[in-house]
């Protein structure tokens, strides 16, 4: 039975040209995390594999940085980066857990950031 839950940064906003950290955390399970995939709508952004480390999709290499931890840092944000992001945790033996983050990139310099999520 899958007992785990994913906590995420939830709905967040950031300024155009700035950067943001997307972070998820899997809790309440002893399952081993074998891989985390990060997706933006229907695009694979990056993968963090327990054995192979990080792979950043070539088309995002200039603007996506791995980490911190299993999270993902998006840089040089544009309004087109607004949308849904998913962290997909592949675990053994539980299976797959998915978390959702909604990012809004604002033109204004008064973007309100959601509470900064930190992994203890």
């Amino acid at each position: 039975m899958m007992t785990g839950t994913i906590e995420t940064t939830g709905n967040i906003s950031a300024e155009k040209g700035g950067s943001i950290i997307l972070q998820c955390h899997l809790s309440s399970t002893t399952a081993q995390v074998t891989q985390v995939n990060w997706e933006q709508q229907d695009q694979l952004l990056a993968i963090c594999n327990a054995d192979l480390g990080w792979h950043i999709s070539p088309s995002f290499k200039d603007r996506v940085a791995p980490g911190p931890g299993l999270g993902l840092t998006l840089q040089s944000l544009t309004v087109n980066d607004t949308g849904e992001y998913f962290c997909i945790y592949h675990t053994y033996p539980d299976g797959t857990y998915t978390g959702r983050i909604f990012l809004e990139v604002l033109e204004s310099s008064v973007a309100e950031h959601g509470a900064r999520f930190q992994i203890p």
Epitope: E39, D42, L44, N49, D51, L52
Partner: antibody
Framework: EVQLLESGGGLVQPGGSLRLSCAAS????????MHWVRQAPGKGLEWVAS????????SYADSVKGRFTISRDNSKNTLYLQMNSLRAEDTAVYYC???????????WGQGTLVTVSS | DIQMTQSPSSLSASVGDRVTITCRAS??????LNWYQQKPGKAPKLLIY???SLQSGVPSRFSGSGSGTDFTLTISSLQPEDFATYYC?????????FGGGTKVEIK
């Protein structure tokens, strides 16, 4: 240089068994998921089975479930496919292949031919 | 299981032609779509992974696009060594499934 070398193919009667091996070199075998993919003569590609890096998680095509078993020995850098209760429709070239990140298959062996016939 | 439908099943083209092969999934597979090239008697070769990423060492005349259910492999200027069979493959979920293949022949 990544190399995958299959062996163990041959002619076997229906109902018989074969064990295919794939010797891997040129990369850290224990870090990669591995696959078996087959191709019947003149036909397309069909995924058969896969196994995660640690060997803990395995998955199979419905057509071989209960008859084929995928396994690996990371200390020997070798992938195996134990094939039991073979049928004529299992006749194919069997390829061993490497699957980084479980998203794509980047290297394939040269294949070994399995012929099931009486 | 996710069905992958490739079209056309075969095509005739000349050196220098622009060639487009399409692949449709029976359900959304995000960008978990790969393209392979296979020549007679040889193992398949990875061309494009994750829908649009060019595998190292593959010529830039090959490109991939699409997401969700509809995907395209484009060869911008067909070369003599490109005459082969091309397969799409989804890795969104097991069982992994391949398209039926597209044979690119010399006109």
């Amino acid at each position: 240089e990544v190399q995958l070398l299959e062996s163990g193919g041959g002619l076997v009667q229906p109902g018989g068994s074969l064990r295919l091996s794939c010797a891997a070199s040129g990369f850290t075998f224990s870090s990669y998921s591995m696959h078996w993919v087959r191709q019947a003569p003149g036909k397309g590609l069909e995924w058969v089975a896969s196994i995660k890096s640690s060997g803990g998680y395995k998955s199979y095509a419905d057509s071989v479930k209960g008859r084929f078993t995928i396994s690996r020995d990371n200390s020997k850098n070798t992938l195996y496919l134990q094939m039991n209760s073979l049928r004529a429709e299992d006749t194919a070239v069997y390829y061993c292949a490497r699957g980084p990140y479980d998203v794509w298959i980047d290297y394939w062996g040269q294949g070994t031919l399995v012929t099931v016939s009486s | 299981d996710i069905q992958m439908t490739q079209s056309p099943s075969s095509l005739s083209a000349s050196v220098g032609d622009r060639v487009t092969i399409t692949c449709r999934a029976s359900q959304s597979i995000s960008s978990y779509l790969n393209w392979y090239q296979q020549k007679p008697g040889k193992a398949p070769k990875l061309l494009i992974y994750a829908a649009s990423s060019l595998q190292s060492g593959v010529p830039s005349r090959f490109s991939g696009s699409g997401s969700g259910t509809d995907f395209t492999l484009t060869i911008s200027s067909l070369q003599p060594e490109d005459f082969a069979t091309y397969y799409c493959q989804q890795s969104y979920s097991t069982p992994l499934t391949f398209g039926g293949g597209t044979k690119v022949e010399i006109k």
